[in-house]
């Protein structure tokens, strides 16, 4: 029951906007009476082009409402975000971005992949939403570990790599030094700590080249480091335990047939790196002739027995420890090894189940006489550092 206030006029009957309703509905609205507007699902309150969560108007003394009627406008999710290394297709109709419209994200085939099905719907909250309820667009993750290389190649005792054999191979150039690394994401390079230790405070002076076979090729893809992360357990000049580092690149590189990350080992990968199993290492380091290789060379080498390797180095270099964070590879008879200038490169293995190559070792250290009999190459055992790698990548 309403008391008509002295000297106040009733307000005009409010008319609900299309796709909206008014509450409460009254026969007459007088001073201080109010009404709210509610929109149907899939429609939103707009004052001009600006969204409102709620709308309530109050009847004033002069018989006018204190604000104009808003519109109930169909929700428009707007153009979907661009997808780096992918694209979006409008399923409902060209450029249709309103309530219940469907879009389909997809990644550039062969080199990128996404974890979801890429289907998004414009929902009532105004966000493009996946079937799992995700509001952020999907990510096109680089495919890893695809290679044209097949085991059986007979670097020291090596042979030249062909295009697409080692697309993860990265050349690290200092002013006077050269080393290698392995691309493990589109903006992360895995390498040996000792290879980049001197550059850790001056990352930008490190020149990173990829997508090449010839060391001096002018047709390289250039990448610049943003930051170098040395494993906190590595002590420079005091052995090679924890000889592992990550380089974050300033920009993501475009993945293609000649530039592609190597996979990180799955938990099950340990079984593929047992004694006598064969891995492959590539590099531009010293060859049998004692000169830096012009062309990227590779060699297929078997994993050596850990105890045998430990014993060899205890004799050769008393005080130098082969730790559980290392794996050894090479022939007892010698002739196949990595060497100076190969440091930081990846010792890779083929995962038979996924048919992808993964990094099992990082070229770390060895005998001064590369490829000598009974003197194995020693590699950082990457599987021991998966939590460390994942932690750095997710936090930086």
């Amino acid at each position: 029951h309403h008391h008509h206030h002295h000297a106040s006029r009733p307000c005009p009957d409010p008319t609900a906007p299309p796709n909206g309703s008014i509450s409460p509905v009254q026969a007459i609205y007088v001073l201080k009476d109010r009404f709210s507007v509610f929109c149907k699902t899939g429609f939103e309150l707009l004052q001009g082009s600006v969204p409102l969560k709620s709308f309530t108007a109050v009847c004033q003394k002069d018989g006018s409402w204190d604000r104009p009627m808003p519109e109930c406008s169909i929700i428009d999710c707007g153009p979907p975000d661009d997808l780096p290394n992918g694209h979006v297709d409008y399923i409902t109709g060209p450029e249709v971005t309103t309530y219940k419209a469907v879009i389909q994200y997809s990644c550039e085939e062969t080199f990128y992949t996404m974890s979801s099905n890429g289907k998004y719907v414009c929902e009532a909250d105004g966000f493009w939403t996946s079937s799992k309820g995700e509001k952020l667009p999907p990510v096109c993750e680089p495919v890893c570990g695809l290679s044209t290389h097949t085991i059986g190649g007979r670097i020291v005792g090596g042979q030249p790599a062909k295009p697409g054999d080692f697309p993860w191979q990265v050349l690290l150039l200092g002013q006077t030094t050269a080393a290698a690394g392995a691309l493990i994401h589109d903006n992360w390079v895995l390498t040996a700590a000792h290879a980049v230790y001197e550059k850790r405070m001056a990352a930008s002076s490190l020149n990173i080249r990829m997508g090449i076979l010839k060391r001096l090729s002018p047709h390289y893809t250039q990448a610049w480091p943003e930051e170098i992360f040395i494993h906190e357990g590595y002590t420079h000049g005091a052995g090679f335990d924890n000889d592992i580092a990550l380089i974050k690149l300033k920009n993501k590189v475009t993945i293609n047939g000649s530039i592609m990350p190597v996979c990180l080992p799955r938990k099950e990968a340990a079984s593929l790196m047992r004694t006598d199993f064969t891995g492959t290492v590539a590099g531009w380091g010293l060859t049998q002739k004692g000169l830096l290789a012009r062309n990227l060379m590779f060699v297929d080498i078997p994993i050596a027995d850990h105890q045998k390797c430990t014993a060899v180095y205890e004799k050769l270099y008393p005080g130098v420890r082969v730790s559980a964070n290392m794996l050894c590879a090479g022939l007892e008879t010698g002739g196949k090894d990595s060497c100076r200038g190969d440091a930081g490169g990846a010792l890779v293995f083929l995962d038979n189940e996924t048919q992808r190559w993964f990094v099992g070792g990082i070229v770390s250290w060895g005998s001064i006489n590369c490829g000598a009999a009974d003197q194995y190459g020693v590699y950082t055992k990457v599987i021991n550092y998966i939590p460390w790698i994942e932690n750095i990548i997710s936090n930086f």
Partner: antibody
Framework: QMQLQESGPGLVKPSQSLSLTCTVT?????????WNWIRQFPGNKLEWMGY???????SYNPSLKSRISITRDTSKNQFFLQLNSVTTEDTATYYC???????WGQGTTLTVSS | DIVMTQSQKLMSTSVGDRVSVTCKAS??????VAWYQQKPGQSPKALIY???YRNSGVPDRFTGSGSGTDFTLTISNVQSEDLAEYFC?????????FGSGTKLEIK
């Protein structure tokens, strides 16, 4: 009483990114309305840069779309402006404001200079 | 983008006078226009929203009118504290756009 307060650096070098914060007190930014960034150039020309709505949806001025991002932290009742690759043309006073324009911050002056 | 034109850059008036500041939109904006007052060294203050609705606390000598493309802010009984610059803004279509401003000087 509701208040908006901008904060950020007074000086930024060309090609760098600008980050500004608007802290809102006396009203929750998720309750309603659109929360705007507006700038005023020397000579007093006003330019609407964009808003983030109560629901977190954003709308940007197309002239800035490739460089601008407006985000929020609802736990702190703040919303943010990031403007990339600034040039001397971005020298202005930056305001945050609630839609209806009934509440504005006092503005923060930004100079872009090397 | 919708262009909001305030053709008068400067207007002179005396205390007690009535003055009208005009704003023209380059296309129909309905009644989705706001008026702001900015005094030297201060941030803008909203006077009128939706063409004719006065913001709370705004003296009733400020009146807004118009729809479509032509809008007017009228100040009746001008006071010395009304010395300021006045801006119109359309919020009908993104991007929201402002007029270039009209400065009011008191003779």
């Amino acid at each position: 009483q509701m208040q908006l307060q901008e904060s950020g650096p007074g000086l930024v070098k060309p090609s760098q990114s600008l980050s500004l914060t608007c802290t809102v007190t006396g009203y929750s930014i998720t309750s309603d309305y659109a929360w705007n960034w507006i700038r005023q150039f020397p000579g007093n020309k006003l330019e609407w840069m964009g808003y983030i709505s109560y629901s977190g949806r954003t709308s940007y001025n197309p002239s800035l779309k490739s460089r601008i991002s407006i985000t929020r932290d609802t736990s702190k009742n703040q919303f943010f402006l990031q403007l990339n690759s600034v040039t001397t043309e971005d020298t202005a006073t930056y305001y945050c404001a609630r839609h209806y324009g009934d509440y504005w911050g006092q503005g923060t002056t930004l100079t872009v200079s090397s | 983008d919708i262009v909001m034109t305030q053709s008068q850059k400067l207007m002179s008036t005396s205390v007690g006078d009535r003055v009208s500041v005009t704003c023209k939109a380059s296309q129909n904006v309905g009644t989705n226009v706001a008026w702001y007052q900015q005094k030297p060294g201060q941030s803008p203050k909203a006077l009128i929203y939706s063409a004719s609705y006065r913001n709370s606390g705004v003296p009733d000598r400020f009146t807004g009118s118009g729809s479509g493309t032509d809008f007017t802010l009228t100040i009746s009984n001008v006071q010395s504290e009304d010395l300021a610059e006045y801006f119109c803004q359309q919020f009908n279509t993104n991007p929201l756009t402002f007029g270039s401003g009209t400065k009011l000087e008191i003779k």
